[in-house]
């Protein structure tokens, strides 16, 4: 009956402010509709970064203005968060919900600490 979600403990964003990680879940049932939400926890505040609902076997589709993209394969979701800056460093938590068919199940990962380092500005060249 358990719904466990696993994600890496730490990820370093690249110089372009992009971070990727895998969110993997152990499904207690055969879900056809899954919702994945990325939450950011910083200073005891929790905000929703992005969310997508997808049908098993189909692609993950975030809203057009979302900073997230992703692909799904079985019980794995590959998430990419773009446009990150140093101030966005924090704990990014993957929440997975098996929306359909009943019963509903929910699982939450322990979070991935994403570190973002703003690139040094290029020195002026004369």
């Amino acid at each position: 009956k358990a719904m466990h979600v696993a994600q890496p403990a730490v990820v370093l964003a690249n110089s372009r402010g992009t971070a990727s990680f895998v969110c993997e879940y152990a499904s207690p049932g055969k879900a056809t509709e899954v919702r994945v939400t990325v939450l950011r926890q910083a200073d005891s505040q929790v905000t929703e970064v992005c969310a997508a609902t997808y049908m098993m076997g189909n692609e993950l589709t975030f809203l057009d203005d979302s900073i997230c993209t992703g692909t799904s394969s079985g019980n794995q979701v590959n998430l990419t968060i773009q446009g990150l800056r140093a101030m966005d460093t924090g704990l990014y938590i993957c929440k997975v919900e098996l929306m359909y068919p009943p019963p509903y199940y929910m699982g939450i990962g322990n979070g991935t600490q994403i570190y973002v380092i703003d690139p040094e500005p290029c020195p002026d060249s004369d």
């Epitope: 009956k1 358990a2 719904m3 466990h4 207690p28 939450l39 929703e48 509903y104 929910m106």
Partner: antibody, heavy 119, light 108 residues
Framework: QVQLVESGGGVVQPGRSLRLSCAAS????????MHWVRQAPGKGLEWVAV????????YYVDSVKGRFTISRDNSNNTLYLQMNSLRAEDTAVYYC????????????WGQGTLVTVSS | EIVLTQSPGTLSLSPGEGATLSCRAS???????LAWYQQKPGQAPRLLIY???SRATGIPDRFSGSGSGTDFTLTISRLEPEDFAVYYC?????????FGPGTKVDIK
């Protein structure tokens, strides 16, 4: 701040219908699962129904399946519970409650509205 | 359906004493997705604990939650006059979401 205000309760005869409303404010309504929880006089809490996010997915406790319908209007930040074929055992205070980011536990509740089913 | 059983049904204690409330599930459920609520007469319930052990915002640290699997505990270290109320546990790992029958903490 988050506010949930229920309305629509009252006295109704067995077999009749009633619609409850819950007006929500102070948060992004469409980002949360919304629930109805009831409490019969002098009894404990009973979860009744949930509707998620865009309104497509809904679940109910067995005792109200086929009689109650939960719905939401995200443009007006309002939650509804349509109650048909009411029975005496449906008499209760009905609370609307907000699920949380970390799961369907309830950090905010309305004040409740009393539904009395009696002939 | 996960059935929650709470014990004792009633706990008679004096202010300043400690209280231990138990919640037992009929089956193990997802990763300690258990919440505790306090309810006073004529009021809506108030969230105390979620995730079995995390205190909700604004809840004093005399309230603590523990447990895993099927056995969970709410502990009130020193009862204040405002703590006399009914306490409910709730599981939210899977539908239907269920509450325990409640434990009433009253003044001895």
């Amino acid at each position: 701040q988050v506010q949930l205000v229920e309305s629509g309760g009252g006295v109704v005869q067995p077999g009749r219908s009633l619609r409850l409303s819950c007006a929500a404010s102070g948060f992004t309504f469409s980002s949360f699962g919304m629930h109805w929880v009831r409490q019969a006089p002098g009894k404990g809490l009973e979860w009744v129904a949930v509707i998620w996010y865009d309104g497509r997915n809904k679940y109910y406790v067995d005792s109200v399946k086929g009689r109650f319908t939960i719905s939401r209007d995200n443009s007006n930040n309002t939650l509804y519970l349509q109650m048909n074929s009411l029975r005496a055992e449906d008499t209760a205070v009905y609370y609307c409650a907000r699920g949380e980011f970390f799961g369907e536990f309830f950090d905010y509740w309305g004040q409740g509205t009393l539904v009395t089913v009696s002939s | 359906e996960i059935v929650l059983t709470q014990s004792p049904g009633t706990l008679s204690l004096s202010p300043g004493e400690g209280a231990t409330l138990s919640c037992r599930a009929s089956q193990s459920f997802s990763s300690n997705y258990l919440a505790w609520y306090q309810q006073k007469p004529g009021q809506a319930p108030r969230l105390l604990i979620y995730g079995a052990s995390s205190r909700a915002t604004g809840i004093p640290d005399r309230f603590s939650g523990s447990g895993s699997g099927t056995d969970f505990t709410l502990t009130i270290s020193r009862l204040e006059p405002e703590d006399f109320a009914v306490y409910y546990c709730q599981q939210y790992g899977t539908s239907p979401f269920t509450f325990g029958p409640g434990t009433k903490v009253d003044i001895k």
